[in-house]
């Protein structure tokens, strides 16, 4: 077996127990079979190798671990627990590894874990205690600062009989363990709504990505507590209008940049306040690109170019005159 490379380039390890000539356990800092390791970069890459389990003999020096493009299916409790622990592991990327089940305590015993990417896994079963590690009402704080959960929605036929949004939010809020989270990415998850309590309990957020979902309204969502929020991505949703309460909250955030492109804005009388706000605010990035989708007569009109005379509502007919 070849020892781990100490150069900054990656060294592919030979399968270190393949020959069985030596029946000794592998050295603690040896590179696992099917992985590439750089001790200088403190990085291990086990990428696109169809692994069905997390390698057991990860080198203790690992700071950045890439396990992308595998077939892990399930992360059990203590999936990364080792003796001695992986005390340096700070960034863990598990994207695209066919995970559909992440159990309670899957990331326990990783005291330095700051970045976790579970994107592009069909997470039909994400335990409420996946990130908190215990079912206590208040857990030990997680060290996580960045949590990337883009495109984790399973196919329709694999979803359980429960709200996918609710399952994800339960994992985010359990035990208040993620109070230190600064970046949360939830893009491309078919979210229809954002549970109202989720943002209030993540007070440290700087970056929130909810792009490419199916959010229709933000009426019940409060951004008031997110005083550190710097970017809010709401592109490619199903937003029709932002109401006064939301506009005021966004305007009150001192560092915020909001991204609203590619939403089907309804340019009727309910849009007047938002148009007025858009003309005055500096928080919306690319606001000159926002266009109406409805009604038909307003399609492709630029929101910033509208005036109050353009924004009318059809009179509501009495029930006796409405057609079915």
């Amino acid at each position: 077996s070849s020892p781990t490379s100490s150069a900054s380039s990656f060294s592919s390890s030979a399968p270190f127990l393949a020959s069985a000539v030596s029946a000794q356990p592998p050295l603690p800092d040896q590179c696992p079979a099917l992985c590439e390791c750089s001790e200088a970069a403190r990085t291990v890459k086990c990428v696109n190798r169809n692994l069905t389990e997390v390698p057991t003999d990860l080198p203790a020096y690992v700071r950045n671990l890439f396990l992308t493009g595998n077939q892990l299916a399930v992360l059990p409790a203590g999936a990364f627990a080792r003796r001695p622990p992986l005390a340096e592991l700070a960034a863990l990327n598990l994207s695209g590894s066919r995970l559909d089940e992440v159990r309670a305590g899957a990331f326990e015993h990783l005291p330095s874990l700051r970045q976790l990417d579970l994107s592009h896994n069909p997470l039909a079963d994400l335990s409420p205690f996946a990130f908190s590690g215990s079912n206590a009402s208040v857990s030990a704080p997680s060290p996580l600062v960045e949590l990337i959960l883009n495109h984790i929605v399973p196919p329709e036929d694999e979803r359980q009989n429960r709200s996918f949004e609710g399952m994800v939010v339960a994992a985010l809020l359990a035990g208040r363990a993620l109070q230190g989270l600064r970046r949360l990415e939830l893009a491309s998850n078919h979210f229809l709504y954002l549970p109202r309590d989720v943002l209030a309990q993540l007070p440290s957020l700087r970056h929130l990505d909810l792009s490419n979902n199916s959010l229709v309204s933000l009426t019940y969502v409060s951004f008031r507590n997110l005083t550190h929020l710097e970017s809010l991505h709401l592109e490619d949703n199903a937003l029709k209008v932002l109401h006064n309460g939301t506009l005021a909250e966004l305007q009150g955030l001192p560092h915020i940049r909001v991204f609203l492109d590619n939403n089907p804005w309804v340019c009727d009388c309910h849009m007047a306040d938002m148009v007025t706000w858009l003309k005055e605010t500096e928080v919306v990035q690319g606001k000159d690109r926002l266009t109406c989708a409805y009604p038909e007569k307003m399609r492709n009109r630029v929101l910033l170019e509208l005036n109050s005379a353009d924004l009318d509502c059809d009179p509501i007919l009495p029930p006796s005159l409405q057609t079915s």
């Epitope: 270190f16 079979a33 099917l34 069905t52 389990e53 299916a73 399930v74 059990p76 559909d100 039909a124």
Partner: antibody, heavy 120, light 111 residues
């Protein structure tokens, strides 16, 4: 046809060593995780050890941890179990078995077994 | 460790009659994605043979008189119409976590 053939069993004194082998044929060996399972005379089945398809993961029962080492050679379609510091209670028929993964898998093919007897 | 307890320890059933074997786990071995419980048959002098995977999925080539059911902690193996060749010891096994464990076995005989 999937075939697993164990060898290397025999009589050994307590404290001694043995190396079991399992020769695989009839399937793509390098695509499958492999287990050792044992059965003491007149007793039930006991899982011993697992190795993943590419030798990245190794697991052992507490009863053998530190004494047994599992390994494989995909080029030779072979699985091994190095058994050191053998005890009377290691006496059993040892089976090798195939699986598609550790937790989401099951023992879907078995060898006929090789008998290990530890006795003074 | 998860303990699997089979009942009964032994069972005598007439040919053509139904045989039922139970397996109880000391904790749940099911998630909403998968059930980590499997059944095996071992005839005298032979290695075990997989019958049922993930609680209820019949292994290819196994006669359809065998069926499995259950989730969580309680599971059942049923032979709808006992045949002479079904005399064997039957084991349940979980793959929820390490260590993998088996039930103690149920010996099935002809009455």
């Amino acid at each position: 046809e999937v075939q697993l053939v164990e060898s290397g069993g025999g009589l050994v004194q307590p404290g001694g060593s043995l190396r079991l082998s399992c020769a695989a044929s009839g399937f793509t060996f390098s695509n499958f995780g492999m287990h050792w399972v044992r059965q003491a005379p007149g007793k039930g089945l006991e899982w011993v050890s697992y190795i993943s398809s590419g030798s990245t993961s190794f697991y052992y029962a507490d009863t053998v941890k530190g004494r047994f080492t599992i390994s494989r050679d995909n080029a030779k379609n072979s699985l091994y179990l190095q058994m050191n510091s053998l005890r009377d209670e290691d006496t059993a028929v040892y089976y090798c078995s195939r699986t598609n993964s550790l937790l989401r898998g099951f023992f879907d093919a078995w060898g006929q077994g090789t008998t290990v007897t530890v006795s003074s | 460790d998860i303990v699997l307890t089979q009942s009964p320890d032994s069972l005598a059933v007439s040919l053509g009659e139904r045989a039922t074997i139970n397996c109880r786990a000391s904790q749940s071995v099911s998630s909403s994605s998968y059930t980590y419980l499997h059944w095996y048959q071992q005839k005298p002098g032979q290695p075990p043979k997989l019958l049922i995977k993930s609680a209820s999925n019949l292994e290819s080539g196994v006669p359809d008189r065998f069926s499995g059911s259950g989730s969580g902690t309680d599971f059942t193996l049923t032979i709808s119409s006992l045949q002479a060749e079904d005399v064997a010891v039957y084991y349940c096994q979980h793959s929820w976590e390490i260590p993998l464990t088996f039930g103690q076995g149920t010996k099935l005989e002809i009455k």
